[in-house]
Amino acid sequence: IVLRPSRVHNSEENTMRALTLKDILNGTFSYKTFFPNWISGQEYLHQSADNNIVLYNIETGQSYTILSNRTMKSVNASNYGLSPDRQFVYLESDYSKLWRYSYTATYYIYDLSNGEFVRGNELPRPIQYLCWSPVGSKLAYVYQNNIYLKQRPGDPPFQITFNGRENKIFNGIPDWVYEEEMLATKYALWWSPNGKFLAYAEFNDTDIPVIAYSYYGDEQYPRTINIPYPKAGAKNPVVRIFIIDTTYPAYVGPQEVPVPAMIASSDYYFSWLTWVTDERVCLQWLKRVQNVSVLSICDFREDWQTWDCPKTQEHIEESRTGWAGGFFVSTPVFSYDAISYYKIFSDKDGYKHIHYIKDTVENAIQITSGKWEAINIFRVTQDSLFYSSNEFEEYPGRRNIYRISIGSYPPSKKCVTCHLRKERCQYYTASFSDYAKYYALVCYGPGIPISTLHDGRTDQEIKILEENKELENALKNIQLPKEEIKKLEVDEITLWYKMILPPQFDRSKKYPLLIQVYGGPCSQSVRSVFAVNWISYLASKEGMVIALVDGRGTAFQGDKLLYAVYRKLGVYEVEDQITAVRKFIEMGFIDEKRIAIWGWSYGGYVSSLALASGTGLFKCGIAVAPVSSWEYYASVYTERFMGLPTKDDNLEHYKNSTVMARAEYFRNVDYLLIHGTADDNVHFQNSAQIAKALVNAQVDFQAMWYSDQNHGLSGLSTNHLYTHMTHFLKQCFSLSD
């Protein structure tokens, strides 16, 4: 018998406590990460605890305050941005959220050399987007859907576009659907590397149908929010890309970049823009039927002052088994020759890997390979390529950072993170300084997150940037649930799952089971990350077992699993959750009379369909802001996976995959339906239609709406939501309050 000190002695057990719902709602056990704001190869900015903006020099070990908290406070700044010449800082205040990424703000420019705010030719307010040029201190900004340029912060602005109009023409910023489903940014303008040119997108939403919903506010009459929002099969935005010379903007004005002929022949999207040099740019386009993507490299023609995109510099990426790319089509990372690039796409075995393209995609050289996936290319230098993958120990829910030496032949691969803090850290991201001289590693778990600084040449750890000591201490007297990540093999499908078990879990006892599901295409729920959240509380205090399962359609395990749901959303995702539940029951510790499922957004759709599957497995379930019919959701997202809702395409499955079609099947389950009335993303319409179908079928159900709340149900609504859902589940599982 080996005696070892136990963490839980009787005396200690008394001081240990379970998590409370209050802990979760107050964010008591939230963690911090440290992402340096790199400004050179060896310097970064960071906002100190007392809100000073501090510049750190790694090599000298020195630091000094570049901007005082007094200055930040004088304008109530919540964000800042240093100009590359270090002469100015913009200060952002009056933040006003719009959609997921977009917001408006007031901007003030502080002159660091003179120690005062810039006066004269002040910026208008509110501004939709503002950024410095990559060199010097030119400013580009978007105001009232038009783009403006300043050569220096105190100079008068030069207006680049004039046709901007609310909800009609968007210049330099995306419309709703491009922001949410294509660009995943608040901006649609891009400076060339040395600031000579500015590229921007123009989105024309004139013909797009409008979603309108009431915002109740406090006034006598609600106001109506109108958003041009193309639902599946509807008219889409028309996009054009322009480039302007910022040195002499009035000389020839904006020049349009031509769209590749094979793309322009039918409806299409612009998916991303990558500058290669000041006079070479790379644009990516996508057919509306999103299985063909074209990468087009364009060159500036000095003589004509135009941009030329030769057919020889067009690279086609096509998927025959699904859609192009993963969630998005990957973007290229160019090498120093300014023509060849590295890009992640599917190899012949159907795994997403890094390829090197020198001339044609057909002649691409595969850089990584195996039954795992390369996930992100962080940086390419003269001699190294840094990327992340889930290769290590064959756990798809991990992320480690690798370095491939591309300067030597044959290239050698090294895992930078695999053995650093093996138990604590299995899920990393990284942030690199210029030329990858230094980098920060941010570990998200499974242990308490930690951020560290490393030498880019030797990979040596230089210092800990943030180790969450306070959190570690706070958790010392908390009975956290146990977590395990394992896999089920079912009919040649691998189902990875995460199980969250009560602190005193005993396999011989029976526990209520809650399935938390998202399940959307190219998503991943089973990840080796740290979290103290609502489900942690349910396990810790309420004694539930919670399980998350990655079924067909989820990411980073190869195309077979990913593309299995192509054109068939709402089928296999649900089947795989049900299969997993049956396997969990077989494990012997689940009380099969007390099984619930819940999900949000796509997860709300899956949980609704699972409850209405007629299996009798689920006693109850919750759908928060669910999609109920793919005809109600955004074109860009929906059509990627479902095709078009037309008779000659996929209308039949659009109709078959609705929640409403299964209204009768909710009769024998307890269903809680929740939605925000001001959801710009998954419109309240979705839940309204579920409710209508349930009423028409005379099926009893519970519902909660959140007035004027969007898809995130934030603020006080969050507290109300989780309290309400907790009561619902405890009632369902016959747990005393």
Epitope: S74, R86, L112, S113, N114, E116
Partner: antibody, heavy 124, light 113 residues
């Protein structure tokens, strides 16, 4: 009493460079920017540039850009102004002056204390 | 750049009399956020550096006699010496510190008549 003490008079040949120092005392050096202003015989005062001692970032009048370099040595509470490629028109009295840093967006200060001046004569 | 123009170039006033110097800027020196005028007045005696008299167009620097006053807003400003004293003989400069480059007027020489 606040003091800004400048280095002595200089005589330089055309094409040469001159470096003038400005040693400050009796105030917190990092609370003020240092500016350089010159006055050619019978001419108006002309701003050359300034520097923030907190970060060492200079700001130059475009007219002098490429010819002037302003630096600080915070440990010695001293500012320097170097003017290169001197020509006869650069003959002037060169002053340093301090200006309080404006932390608030509604602030902004004039140059409240000046050095005694340094006569730079450019002659062949 | 903001151009500062003073008038007159020189001024001869009897002791005890009022002296008025005007200064015009090529653009407004009012900052919309605080409605202040970013204009200063300096006095320079022979062989000496300039001395700050007035800032914000009308606020006297501490230690400056109250016979010196500043007024005006936007683009037109005035320095007034209500009762000229012998020690007030000097060249007076206006200066804008609204934006860079900082610029000065050409100066007004005040003498005793």
């Amino acid at each position: 009493q606040v003091q800004l003490v400048q280095s002595g008079a200089e005589v330089k040949k055309p094409g040469a460079s001159v470096k003038v120092s400005c040693k400050t005392s009796r105030y917190t050096f990092t609370e003020y920017t240092i500016h350089w202003v010159r006055q050619a015989p019978g001419q108006r005062l002309e701003w050359i540039g300034g520097i923030n001692p907190n970060n060492g970032i200079p700001n130059y009048n475009q007219k002098f850009k490429g010819r002037v370099t302003i630096t600080v040595d915070t440990s010695a509470s001293t500012a320097y102004m170097e003017l290169s490629s001197l020509r006869s028109e650069d003959t002037a009295v060169y002053y340093c002056a301090r200006r309080r840093i404006a932390y608030g967006y509604d602030e902004g200060h004039a140059m409240d204390y000046w050095g005694q001046g340094t006569l730079v004569t450019v002659s062949s | 750049d903001i151009v500062m123009t003073q008038s007159p170039d020189s001024l001869a006033v009897s002791l005890g009399e009022r002296a008025t110097i005007n200064c015009k800027s090529s653009q407004s020196l009012i900052y919309s956020r605080n409605q202040k005028n970013y204009l200063a007045w300096y006095q320079q005696k022979p062989g000496q550096p300039p001395k700050l008299l007035i800032f914000w167009a009308s606020t006297r620097e501490s230690g400056v006699p109250d016979r010196f006053s500043g007024s005006g807003f936007g683009t037109d400003f005035t320095l007034t010496i209500s009762s000229l004293q012998a020690e007030d003989v000097a060249v007076y400069y206006c200066q804008q510190y609204f934006s860079y480059p900082l610029t000065f007027g050409q100066g007004t020489k005040v003498e005793i008549k």
